[in-house]
Every structure is written in C-alpha cells, then in structure tokens.
C-alpha cells in the first residue's frame, strides 16, 4: 500500500507560492502534532494487548538506532533541515505502522484514525518545510533516510518496532515544539 | 460552505423501523467519513454510527449495534440511517455531522437535525 | 466505556465575567477531548479539540486546558450571546462519549 508519505529529493521547483506565515503554520503543526503524540503512543501500546502494557520500557523504550538528529540550539536553517529529515523518516514509519496495523487490527477505529492524522499533519509539514527551506535558504536537495520496513518481520516484531517508534516520535515531537 | 440536511424523522412504534437521510453540499462528500450523533429529550449527547469516506467501514456503540445501519452513496451526496428494533430510548433528535478532517474524531459540522419519537 | 461527567448542570455568571466549565474523564484521556457550545434551538457548534486547540473562527475568549482526566473550558469575558449548554467530548477511543452538559446562565 501507498506509504502516507512519499519522499522526494528536494528541489526548489516549488509549483506554489508559500503559505503567508510559513513559520508560524510550522510552529502550529508541530503543536498539533505534540498535543496528539502521547494518546497516539498510548492508544497503540493498549491494542497490542500484552506484553506491551506492562513492558513498556523493554518493548517501547525510544531505543530507534537509525533516528536523524536534531539540535535544537542550531540556526533556523540547520533546524530546519534536521525537522525536514526526521518528518520524512516519521512519514514512512509511520506508514508500515499503519499497514501493518490495519491487518493486526482491524477493528481499531481510533488508533487508525490518529495515526492517519498524524500521517495527514505530516504531509502538510514536510510541504512547509520544504517551501521555508527553498524560498528562504535555497536548499534544493536534502539527503534522507527512510524508517525499517517491516514487511518481512513476525507479527511480534512488527509490534515492537512500531511502539519503540511511536516512543521515539512522543519524546522527539515535544522536543521539535519547543525548539520553534 | 458545508451544508448538511437531515430527513426522514417522525413517529415511530416500538419494534419498528425508520431510514433516515442526510443530504450533503458545499464539500466534496466522498472524502470525508461520516458520522452520526443523537440528542435525547433529556438532551445527553450520544454517538451513534460511523461510516468510512468509501462505505467500507462502519462502527457502532454498543446501545445500537445489530439494531441500526449506516450507509452513504456517494454519487447522491447521501447519508443514510437505517434504524430497525426501535426502543422508547432511542427518541431523540438525530444530527448528521461531518467531521473538519478526513481523520478527525471531534463533530465540526452538524446539520439541523431530525427528530424521531418512538412511542406507542 | 470512558465516563465523561460535568458535575455542573447549571453555572450562573454576569456579562464581563470569567466563568470556567469542567469536565471529568473516568481515565486518562491524553488530552483528547473536544468542547462544544449549543445555543438554545441550535444545533450544536465545536469550539475546542485536543483539549486546547481552537477550531476555525471561534473567538480567543475561549480556552481549553487540562490534561490526563481533568478537563476545562473558560470563557474570559462572558458575553450575553454565550448563554447556552456546554458539552464536553472524549475522542480518546470508540465509542465516543460526551459530558452530561453544563447549561450557562446570564445573570
């Protein structure tokens, strides 16, 4: 299925003028997405059903090896580019998550919900981003990474890597908010 | 601007059955879910039925499951409640409401209601 | 089912006035609660999401706060237009479920 982001090179071909207040719709998004971020985290953990409750630090501490970084006392366009990398890579994780839950269960109408808000919230971030970094820095090309592809992982596994993910968005999101 | 109108209210016997409409305009109706949500006399607010934008999916309380059916055609801009077994409970003024994002679960947009009074 | 409760049926306050209309979750909802304002013959009308965010063209004299299953809408300058029933939401998890209401007065 189509991953709710899909990753371009970032070129500074932008096809529409930026939004009025770029930076203040960015700060808005990131609210949007912190204020979200702990019942999305939560929600996921309960309909994984046990072990998850009860091992949260071993099944989804934010343990995510391959994470881009951020430095939140950086310039804007140092920022800027570190958010740009890290919403590409919450883009496709959160995609396999959302794949992978619709088959794991499928009758979880909320969690299905925000994590497709969450994915919809993105999407309009990366674009922000995006326009910010090329009209105001000229930043045509932003080397990325991509978040695991779980497609070939056991049921158990897929879960895992979907909680220690969404830890890692909960604990890196309110770090993003603050640092706008 | 978002225009929902609901339909097909009145008097209804206990076991009885009623199907409801809401006709949508001003947005494009197929990419958004859809919900329903009722008022009772005592005026408790209760969510009622969800429906996915494609029709696929449909959720329900537990007070109205295997009782009432939500559908949507969406060439016709339609919403639909199909209510069968009605209870004297289930009176109340019931809202069509569409939600402010596709993936929302808070009511942004209510039409004027309907009510259906179940009553001998 | 998560149990929203509005101990408050009825508030009285005066125009001018700061009024603040609670709302109680039976378990944490994380901030996942809407407010909605109905005016008398009207339908219903969504002021807040996520506890705290105002919706399209709802005045800033409307506020939401709270957090784990306490839950607040204050309203900074009551306006005689604001007599209504307040309804809180969870949008927590299925099934979706709303406070009792809280009716304010204008003295």
């Known amino acids: 299925s189509p991953l709710p982001i899909t990753p371009v090179n970032a070129t500074c071909a932008i096809r529409h003028p930026c939004h009025n207040n770029l930076m203040n719709q960015i700060r808005s998004q990131l609210a949007q997405l912190n204020g979200s971020a702990n019942a999305l985290f939560i929600l996921y953990y309960t309909a994984q059903g046990e072990p998850f409750p009860n091992n949260l630090d071993k099944l989804c501490g934010p343990n995510v090896t391959d994470f881009p970084p951020f430095h939140a006392n950086g310039t804007e366009k140092a920022k800027l580019v570190e958010l740009y990398r890290i919403v590409v890579y919450l883009g496709t994780s959160l995609g396999n998550i959302t794949r992978d839950q619709k088959i794991l269960n499928p009758s979880a109408l909320s969690l299905h919900s925000k994590l497709n808000a969450t994915a919809d919230i993105l999407r309009g971030l990366l674009s922000n981003v995006l326009c910010r970094l090329c009209s105001k820095y000229h930043v045509g090309h932003v080397d990325v990474t991509y978040g695991p592809d779980t497609s070939g992982k056991d049921v158990f596994q897929k879960k895992k890597l979907g909680c220690q993910l969404l830890g890692k968005y909960k604990e890196t999101i309110a770090v993003l908010a603050q640092a706008f | 601007e978002v225009m929902l109108v609901e339909s097909g209210g009145g008097l209804v016997q206990p076991g009885g059955s009623r199907r409801l409409s809401c006709a949508a305009s001003?947005?494009?109706?197929?990419?958004?879910?859809m919900f329903w949500v009722r008022q009772t006399p005592e005026k408790r607010m209760e969510w009622v039925a969800y429906?996915?934008?494609?029709?696929?999916?449909?959720y329900y309380p537990d007070t109205v499951k295997g009782r009432f059916t939500v559908s949507r055609d969406n060439a016709k801009n339609t919403l639909y409640l199909q209510m069968s077994s009605l209870k004297s409970v289930d009176t109340a003024i019931y809202y069509c409401v569409r939600p402010s994002a596709r993936y929302d679960e808070w009511f942004a947009y209510w039409g004027q209601g309907t009510l259906v009074t179940v009553s001998a | 089912d998560i149990v929203m409760t509005q101990s408050h049926k009825f508030m009285s306050t005066s125009v001018g006035d700061r009024v603040s209309i609670t709302c109680k979750a039976s378990?944490?909802?994380?901030?996942?609660v809407a407010w909605y304002q109905q005016k008398p013959g009207q339908s219903p009308r969504l002021l807040i999401y996520w506890a705290s965010f105002r919706h399209t063209g709802v005045p800033d004299r409307f506020t939401g706060s709270g957090s784990g299953t306490e839950y607040t809408l204050t309203i900074s300058r009551v306006q005689a237009e604001d007599l209504a029933l307040y309804y809180c939401?969870?949008?927590?998890?299925?099934?979706?479920?709303f406070g009792g209401g809280t009716r304010l007065e204008i003295k």
């Open positions: 378990q944490d909802v994380s901030n996942a």
């Open positions: 939401q969870q949008h927590y998890n299925t099934p979706y479920t």
């Open positions: 001003g947005f494009t109706f197929s990419s958004y879910p």
């Open positions: 429906i996915s934008n494609g029709g696929d999916s449909t």
